[in-house]
């Protein structure tokens, strides 16, 4: 595993990455839960959506999220003009016309109604930390991930590779 400088190195070029094509390469409808199997739920309150992290009662239906996968070219670190590789970026939409957004000033995750093309704040780099867990890194703020804080989703700064496996930034996707 690489140290802090490594994390900074791999995140630095995120700002420069370009999404190739406007349409997603695939879309996937899944329920989202935390590493500890709490469900991510969405509730309409006062004409806006709130996001909760909670234990569901037995047989209670899980909320589904539409994940749209986009391919993003990553500039080469070495030459500066080549492409070093590709990343997967996702947008997350729990209901029509609403998308998860990173509010970097408030360190919060919010649902916003918007039209396409979506702003950069709605895109998250998809990481697999484990074979069955994913993490979501802000396109607009490299090194910052969606995480769980006080039973809500929040933006959490990850400053070393060891912390990439911290449970509060790990999520499970399930089709059921």
């Amino acid at each position: 595993a690489f140290g802090i400088s490594g994390v900074q190195k791999y995140t630095r070029a995120l700002h420069d990455s370009s999404i190739t094509g406007i349409s997603p390469i695939t879309e996937y409808l899944a329920s989202l839960s935390t590493y500890n199997d709490q469900s991510i739920t969405f509730a309409l309150e006062d004409e806006s959506y709130e996001i909760y992290v909670e234990d569901l009662k037995k047989d209670e239906k899980k909320d589904k999220v539409l994940l749209s996968y986009y391919e993003s070219q990553h500039p080469s670190n070495e030459s500066g003009d080549g492409v070093d590789g590709k990343m997967l970026m996702v947008t997350l939409s729990p209901t029509k016309d609403f998308w998860l957004h990173a509010n970097n000033k408030e360190h919060s995750v919010e649902l916003h109604k918007c039209e396409k093309p979506l702003p950069d704040q709605a895109f998250f780099v998809l990481h697999n930390m484990h074979s069955n867990c994913v993490s979501f890194e802000c396109k607009t703020d490299p090194g910052v991930f969606i995480g769980v804080k006080d039973n809500h989703l929040a933006l959490i700064k990850v400053d070393s590779s060891e912390n990439l496996c911290t449970e509060n930034i790990l999520f499970k996707l399930s089709e059921t």
Epitope: A1, Y28, D84, G85, K86, V125, L126, N128, S131, S161
Partner: antibody, heavy 122, light 107 residues
Framework: EVQLVESGGGLVQPGTSLKLSCLAS????????MTWIRQAPGKGLEWIAS????????YYPDSVKGRFTISRDDAKSTLYLQMNSLRSEDTATYYC???????????????WGQGTLVTVSS | DIQMTQSPASLSASLGETVSIECLAS??????LAWYQQKSGKSPQLLIY???RLQDGVPSRFSGSGSGTRFSLKISGMQPEDEADYFC?????????FGSGTKLEIK
Amino acid sequence: EVQLVESGGGLVQPGTSLKLSCLASGFTFNNYWMTWIRQAPGKGLEWIASITYTGGGTYYPDSVKGRFTISRDDAKSTLYLQMNSLRSEDTATYYCTRANYYYNTYGGFPYWGQGTLVTVSS
Amino acid sequence: DIQMTQSPASLSASLGETVSIECLASEGFSNDLAWYQQKSGKSPQLLIYAASRLQDGVPSRFSGSGSGTRFSLKISGMQPEDEADYFCQQGSKYPLTFGSGTKLEIK
């Protein structure tokens, strides 16, 4: 240009050990999941081991679990496969492969080494 | 484990003919399905990923389709260089599994 070069194969006796290496070049090694896949002579492909891009997670099928260990040295851009308690059914060409995307397992394996042959026989 | 049943096991096709190979999964999964071509004595080469995405540098006569449990690879207009073994692979759930392969020969 992405290159993966395996080494370390050869003829060994059942019950012994062998360590394979894969030297990677042409890409940022520590951003990718890496995987070993093998192919017995005249047979199909079999997934053997995967390691996360951070090195923090390793995964194996039941056929090699407890006998094989995948590891990586990011400073040397090298992937390893330590094989212990080798059996005749481990005879195969072993390929080192790289994932399609940074940080991620999705999208198959676009890059393969030339393979290294391991023969387990008495 | 997800079993990948690939058919047919072997296939002979004339030059210019359209060929299809199918992969049937024992359970449904997201479309993390790849197709590989392996020529005799060579390493496998990725043709299709995400069930239908063409890998860079692969001729457009190759196409992939399907979702859930049923996936297929189509070669529209068989060429001499397409004589090879073809494998499907699911990457959705560990352990990763491959189809048993299809040997494609020229008639």
